[in-house]
Interface confidence: medium
C-alpha cells in the first residue's frame, strides 16, 4: 500500500493510473467504501463523503489515463485509506495528515520556552526533528520543547516529520522579542549630554506596553526609578520622570533617552524593562554610564572616573605628544606639580581609547615678552 504524507491546510494529490491511456470510468472511495468522486463520461461526479466540497480531480489528465484525487485544505481527520477503482483494479493509497503548531503564540520573549505540538492521526507513530535558524537541531515526539529562547532563535524553524520512512516538512516563523543588545556602556566627560538608545530586535505592526528605567548610581545606596513610560502603537509617552536627573525621552521608536549632562553622581548602571501587552514577562536591557572628570587644584592635577569600569581598564595622565606620566588600573590618577601645557586624561582598554578629557595647565610664572 502506497503511503502519502500531507500537511494540515495544504493540498494533496493522490495518483491513480490506468494501463489504457484514455478516459475510462474510475471511482475514488474511502475505507468505508463511501464514494468521494468519479466520472460519468467527461463529467466529474461527487459522492456523499465529508470531502465533498474539498475534493477534486484533473480532467485534463483523464485522456492520458491519469485519475488523481485532489484534496484541498487538508484536515487531520482526512487521514484514511483511499481506494481508486479503475479497470477492475483497486489502487490503495494511505494518506496521513500532520499538523505542527507553536504553543499559543509565535512571538515569544527572550528566555521563554517554545513548544511545538504535532497533531497526528490515530495509530501513527511519527517523530519530529527541528532545526532552528542558528543551526541547532532538536528532536521529539508529539511535542518538542526549546527552553531559554535566544535572539538568534528568531526566524524560520524547519521541522521534518518522519513516518513510514516518508517525510513531510514544516516551516514555522518564530519571533523572539528582545532588545538588540543585552547590555551597553556609555563613556562621557563630565558635563556632556548623554544619549541612551534601546533598539528592539524585532518589528511588529502594533507595539503596546509600558516601561521603566531603574538606576543604581555608584554613589547611591539603593536604586531609584528615573523614568516610567507607556508605549501605544509605537508612540512613546512619559508617565513619570525624576526631577534629578530630568531625563528626556523620544516620542518614537527606538526608545531613546537623553540625560542633559553627565555628572559623577549619575555614573552607574541602569536596567530598562519593557512589559508588552498580552505578554507575560518583560524585556530587559542593561545600560552603564562611566563619567570622567579632570581637575587642577593648586599643585595637584587629578583625573577620576566613576561608574562600572572593568579592572583591566587603564587610566592615564599625559602631556600632549609625550609619554604618559602616570598609568594605573585605578579609578583615580594624579600628577603633583604638573608642567604647563595641554594635559590629556585617557581611559583605555588594551590601547584603545574609550574616553578622553583635556585640561590646560597654565605656567605658574610668566616671562616678559621680549621687545
Amino acid at each position: 500500500k502506497k503511503v502519502v504524507l500531507g500537511k494540515k491546510g495544504d493540498t494533496v494529490e493522490l495518483t491513480c493510473t490506468a494501463s489504457q491511456k484514455k478516459s475510462i470510468q474510475f471511482h475514488w472511495k474511502n475505507s468505508n467504501q463511501i464514494k468521494i468522486l468519479g466520472n460519468q463520461g467527461s463529467f466529474l461526479t461527487k459522492g456523499p463523503s465529508k470531502l465533498n466540497d474539498r475534493a477534486d480531480s484533473r480532467r485534463s489528465l483523464w485522456d492520458q489515463g491519469n485519475f488523481p484525487l485532489i484534496i484541498k485544505n487538508l484536515k487531520i481527520e482526512d487521514s484514511d485509506t483511499y481506494i481508486c477503482e479503475v479497470e477492475d483494479q483497486k489502487e490503495e493509497v494511505q494518506l496521513l495528515v500532520f499538523g505542527l503548531t507553536a504553543n499559543s503564540d509565535t512571538h515569544l520573549l527572550q528566555g521563554q520556552s517554545l513548544t511545538l505540538t504535532l497533531e497526528s492521526p490515530p495509530g501513527s507513530s511519527p517523530s519530529v526533528q527541528c532545526r532552528s535558524p542558528r543551526g541547532k537541531n532538536i528532536q521529539g515526539g508529539k511535542t518538542l520543547s526549546v527552553s531559554q529562547l535566544e535572539l538568534q532563535d528568531s526566524g524560520t524553524w524547519t521541522c521534518t516529520v518522519l513516518q513510514n520512512q516518508k517525510k513531510v516538512e514544516f516551516k514555522i516563523d518564530i519571533v523572539v522579542l528582545a532588545f538588540q543588545k543585552a547590555s551597553s556602556i556609555v563613556y562621557k566627560k563630565e558635563g556632556e549630554q548623554v544619549e541612551f538608545s534601546f533598539p528592539l530586535a524585532f518589528t511588529v505592526e502594533k507595539l503596546t506596553g509600558s516601561g521603566e528605567l531603574w538606576w543604581q548610581a555608584e554613589r547611591a545606596s539603593s536604586s531609584k526609578s528615573w523614568i516610567t513610560f507607556d508605549l501605544k502603537n509605537k508612540e512613546v509617552s512619559v508617565k513619570r520622570v525624576t526631577q534629578d536627573p530630568k531625563l528626556q525621552m523620544g516620542k518614537k521608536l527606538p526608545l531613546h533617552l537623553t540625560l542633559p549632562q553627565a555628572l559623577p553622581q549619575y555614573a552607574g548602571s541602569g536596567n530598562l524593562t519593557l512589559a508588552l501587552e498580552a505578554k507575560t514577562g518583560k524585556l530587559h536591557q542593561e545600560v552603564n554610564l562611566v563619567v570622567m572628570r579632570a581637575t587642577q587644584l593648586q599643585k595637584n592635577l587629578t583625573c577620576e572616573v566613576w561608574g562600572p569600569t572593568s579592572p583591566k581598564l587603564m587610566l592615564s595622565l599625559k602631556l600632549e605628544n609625550k609619554e604618559a606620566k602616570v598609568s594605573k588600573r585605578e579609578k583615580a590618577v594624579w600628577v603633583l606639580n604638573p608642567e604647563a601645557g595641554m594635559w590629556q586624561c585617557l581611559l583605555s582598554d588594551s590601547g584603545q581609547v574609550l574616553l578622553e578629557s583635556n585640561i590646560k595647565v597654565l605656567p605658574t610664572w610668566s616671562t616678559p615678552v621680549q621687545p
Partner: antibody, heavy 118, light 108 residues
Framework: EVQLVESGGGLVQPGGSLRLSCAAS????????MHWVRQATGKGLEWVST???????YYPGSVKGRFTISRENAENSLYLQMNSLRAGDTALYYC????????????WGQGTTVTVSS | EIVLTQSPGTLSLSPGERATLSCRAS???????LAWYQQKPGQAPRLLIY???NRATGIPDRFSGSGSGTDFTLTISRLEPEDFAVYYC?????????FGPGTKVDIK
C-alpha cells in the same frame, strides 16, 4: 548509481572569487541536506557550509560573509560561491549529501582543489 | 562552538587486534547528532556510524559506536588490513557542525 561530482576549483589570487559546483545524480536531490567540507593537504576535515531541504543555510565563522551556499533542485546542483579568498582557504573541497533525519554525510564526491596564491 | 577532541592521535595496532577510538565533546551532544567517518589516503571520507551507534549501509559489523553526552567511542572489534586509516567524529547538534581532528590507526 548515487553520485556527486564537484567542479570549478582552480588557482585564484588572494581577494579573488571562485564558484564551485556539485552535480548530483541517482537520488532525489531536493530531499537531502547538502554540505561542503574542505581538507587542506595533510590536515583534517573542516565543515564549510550546509544547505537544508528548505533552503536554510549554515556557515562557520571562518567563512561567514565570504562564502554563499545555494542549490538548484530542478538542476540537481549545489553551489559554493567563494569571495574574498585567502591563502587559508586553499584546500580540497568536497561536496557531501546529508540525510536530514539520520545525521551523517553518507555520500561524498571526489573533491575539487582550490588554491589561493599570488 | 562545540569542540571535539579525539584520542589517541595515533593508534598503532596489528591486524586482528581491537581498536578503541575516543571522541570527547566540549559540551553535551545528543547521540542522534554524532557521526563517525573513515578516510584512506587519496580517498573521500566514508560514513561509518550515524546517530552515535547506527552502522551506515554496507559497513561491516566489526565497526560499532557507543556513548552519549560528551563521551563517544568507535570500536573496531578485529582490525582487518583495510581498516588502517584516519577516523573522524563529527557533531550535528549545533552549527558550526564541527569535526574532530582525527585518529590515525596504523600498522604496528
Amino acid at each position: 548509481e548515487v553520485q556527486l561530482v564537484e567542479s570549478g576549483g582552480g588557482l585564484v589570487q588572494p581577494g579573488g572569487s571562485l564558484r564551485l559546483s556539485c552535480a548530483a545524480s541517482g537520488f532525489t536531490f531536493s530531499s537531502y541536506d547538502m554540505h561542503w567540507v574542505r581538507q587542506a593537504t595533510g590536515k583534517g576535515l573542516e565543515w564549510v557550509s550546509t544547505i537544508g531541504t528548505a533552503g536554510d543555510t549554515y556557515y562557520p565563522g571562518s567563512v561567514k560573509g565570504r562564502f554563499t551556499i545555494s542549490r538548484e533542485n530542478a538542476e540537481n546542483s549545489l553551489y559554493l560561491q567563494m569571495n574574498s579568498l585567502r591563502a587559508g582557504d586553499t584546500a580540497l573541497y568536497y561536496c557531501a549529501r546529508g540525510d536530514y533525519y539520520y545525521y551523517g554525510m553518507d555520500v561524498w564526491g571526489q573533491g575539487t582543489t582550490v588554491t589561493v596564491s599570488s | 562552538e562545540i569542540v571535539l577532541t579525539q584520542s589517541p592521535g595515533t593508534l598503532s595496532l596489528s591486524p586482528g587486534e581491537r581498536a578503541t577510538l575516543s571522541c570527547r565533546a566540549s559540551q553535551s551532544v545528543s547521540s542522534t547528532y554524532l557521526a563517525w567517518y573513515q578516510q584512506k589516503p587519496g580517498q573521500a571520507p566514508r560514513l561509518l556510524i550515524y546517530g552515535a551507534s547506527n552502522r551506515a549501509t554496507g559497513i561491516p559489523d566489526r565497526f560499532s559506536g557507543s556513548g552519549s553526552g560528551t563521551d563517544f567511542t568507535l570500536t573496531i572489534s578485529r582490525l582487518e588490513p583495510e581498516d588502517f586509516a584516519v577516523y573522524y567524529c563529527q557533531q550535528f547538534g549545533t552549527s558550526p557542525f564541527t569535526f574532530g581532528p582525527g585518529t590515525k590507526v596504523d600498522i604496528k
